[in-house]
Interface confidence: low
């Protein structure tokens, strides 16, 4: 091991403060006590350290906590978080939502980095499920977060968390993901009345089975074409012309513009021409 340089007389840091920005890297290494740094991590962010100086501070923490940092330090990492590798983060055990928020704030406005992805993965695994508060937090920082999860990961979302999901959070979800989320949403919103229920469930209908679509067609919901186009083809095919007409209400005219696209194309091919003609849209089966 390389012999450590001694701290020059009078330069031992009694606390983490602005004077340290004038220390050379070797002076920071020699003169800043790691345990002091750990208890005053919250001050590091307020001091304009260079990237090189932050590297030294990280090294000191790594020496103090070779098996990973305690959450009391992690919560105050601030910009030092950007210096962490996914390997560093895998050693952590983050359980406090405040800690998660503090670190996501540091990365705000940027794409989800490998560090952030690892942090979120550690956090969610530690909690055992994606509870509502966590989901609220993650979707606020990363609206596409939910759709980045595998169906297996989504299965850990409890129905109560679905209340935190906004329509835009589901924009990039594929049918396999909606298949997992829809039954949870159905359970979460089951006590709402017809029109309120439809407003809430609408974004999840890409996972709905035929029988639920049939039930909705009896409730004057006036589904828009954008929602209809996201429905599962296998769920739409068994619907009758009358049921689709009731489901779409005044939006039924939009079928003409979508007649070459799935699921409308496949549905049209399954219908009797006489039934299609009752719509008066010139749809050809």
């Amino acid at each position: 091991e390389v012999e450590k340089t001694a701290c020059p007389s009078g330069k031992k840091a009694p606390e983490i403060d602005e004077s340290l920005i004038f220390y050379k890297k070797w002076e920071l290494e020699a003169c800043v006590d790691a345990a002091l740094l750990a208890t005053q991590m919250d001050r590091v962010n307020a001091i304009p350290f260079t990237y090189e100086q932050l590297d030294v501070l990280k090294h000191k923490l790594d020496e103090l906590y070779p098996q990973g940092y305690p959450e009391s330090v992690i919560q105050h990492l601030g910009y030092l978080f950007l210096k962490m590798s996914p390997e560093d983060i895998r050693k952590w055990n983050v359980t406090s939502l405040e800690t998660l928020k503090a670190l996501l704030e540091v990365n705000k406005g940027h794409e989800m980095s490998p560090q952030v992805a690892t942090l979120i993965d550690r956090f969610v695994k530690g909690r055992g499920q994606l509870d509502k508060d966590t989901l609220d937090t993650l979707t606020a920082f990363y609206p596409g977060y939910l759709c980045s999860l595998s169906p297996e990961e989504l299965s850990s979302v409890p129905p109560s968390s679905i209340w935190a999901v906004r329509p835009q959070d589901l924009d990039t979800c594929d049918p396999r993901q909606l298949d997992v989320l829809y039954p949870k949403a159905r359970l979460a919103f089951q006590n709402m009345n017809g029109s309120e229920y439809f407003v809430k469930i609408q974004s999840f209908l890409g996972g709905a089975p035929t029988e639920d679509l049939k039930a909705l067609s009896q409730q004057n919901v006036s589904m828009d074409l954008a929602t209809f186009m996201k429905l599962r083809t296998d769920a739409v095919l068994p619907l009758t012309v009358a049921e689709v007409q009731k489901l779409l209400g005044p939006h039924v005219e939009g079928l003409k513009a979508e007649e070459r696209h799935r699921p409308v194309r496949d549905w049209i091919l399954r219908q009797r021409q006489d039934d299609l003609d009752t719509l008066g849209l010139g749809l050809q089966g």
Epitope: E15, R43, Q67
Partner: antibody, heavy 115, light 107 residues
Framework: DVQLQESGPGMVKPSQSLSLTCTVT?????????WHWIRHFPGNKLEWMGY???????NYNPSLKSRISITHDTSKNHFFLKLKSVTTEDTATYYC????????WGQGTTLTVSS | DIVMTQSQKFMSTSVGDRVSITCKAS??????VAWYQQKPGQSPKALIH???NRHTGVPDRFTGSGSGTDFTLTISNVQSEDLADYFC?????????FGGGTKLEIK
């Protein structure tokens, strides 16, 4: 030398709110550290309640989250604990303390919740 | 929450003896543990942190050791003024949690 001193009412009735003050001398609460409230129950159990950091951010024990609020008055170098809807279960000695593995503790103030 | 267990509620020792007080964490807390001494009628006093560093002014007869889930506070050459409650704290995760305490009695 850093010193912390708790002050409060000594007795509170059930369902009322409890307010405690921690006066810090010898160190500015805006200079660093987390500033904690911890309580010690009669049966010898210690419970961490939460903290306010030098910058004003807070973190609370989830078991108390709906009832607890920690604030500070930086001009007076004080920080405060407010606990709503107290019950006899909140009878304890309340300590304020500095730092993550707290290095300085106040003398404690005993609170009895009784009608 | 992480549970910190001090299985010995009371320990009896004599002046000059060496005594070890143990603390077990319900999960791996690495080295994020501190030890405190509380004498009758006084507030807790920080002894050891991380988990083998003595706080300023703490006599060197107090030593801490351990990592992961098992931690020990050792007092060598016990003095009569060491009569007190001793408890551990983990700060690896929030909420911070304490052990139930071990009361050291001097024969």
């Amino acid at each position: 030398d850093v010193q912390l001193q708790e002050s409060g009412p000594g007795m509170v009735k059930p369902s009322q709110s409890l307010s405690l003050t921690c006066t810090v001398t010898g160190y500015s609460i805006t200079s660093g550290y987390d500033w904690h409230w911890i309580r010690h129950f009669p049966g010898n159990k210690l419970e961490w309640m939460g903290y306010i950091s030098y910058s004003g951010s807070t973190n609370y024990n989830p078991s108390l989250k709906s009832r607890i609020s920690i604030t500070h008055d930086t001009s007076k170098n004080h920080f405060f604990l407010k606990l709503k809807s107290v019950t006899t279960e909140d009878t304890a000695t309340y300590y304020c303390a500095r730092g993550t593995g707290p290095d300085y503790w106040g003398q404690g103030t005993t609170l009895t919740v009784s009608s | 929450d992480i549970v910190m267990t001090q299985s010995q509620k009371f320990m009896s020792t004599s002046v000059g003896d060496r005594v070890s007080i143990t603390c077990k964490a319900s999960q791996n807390v690495r080295t994020a543990v501190a030890w405190y001494q509380q004498k009758p009628g006084q507030s807790p006093k920080a002894l050891i942190h991380l988990p083998s560093n003595r706080h300023t002014g703490v006599p060197d007869r107090f030593t801490g050791s351990g990592s992961g889930t098992d931690f020990t506070l050792t007092i060598s050459n016990v003095q009569s003024e060491d009569l007190a409650d001793y408890f551990c704290l983990q700060h690896w995760n929030y909420p911070l949690t304490f052990g139930g305490g071990t009361k050291l009695e001097i024969k």
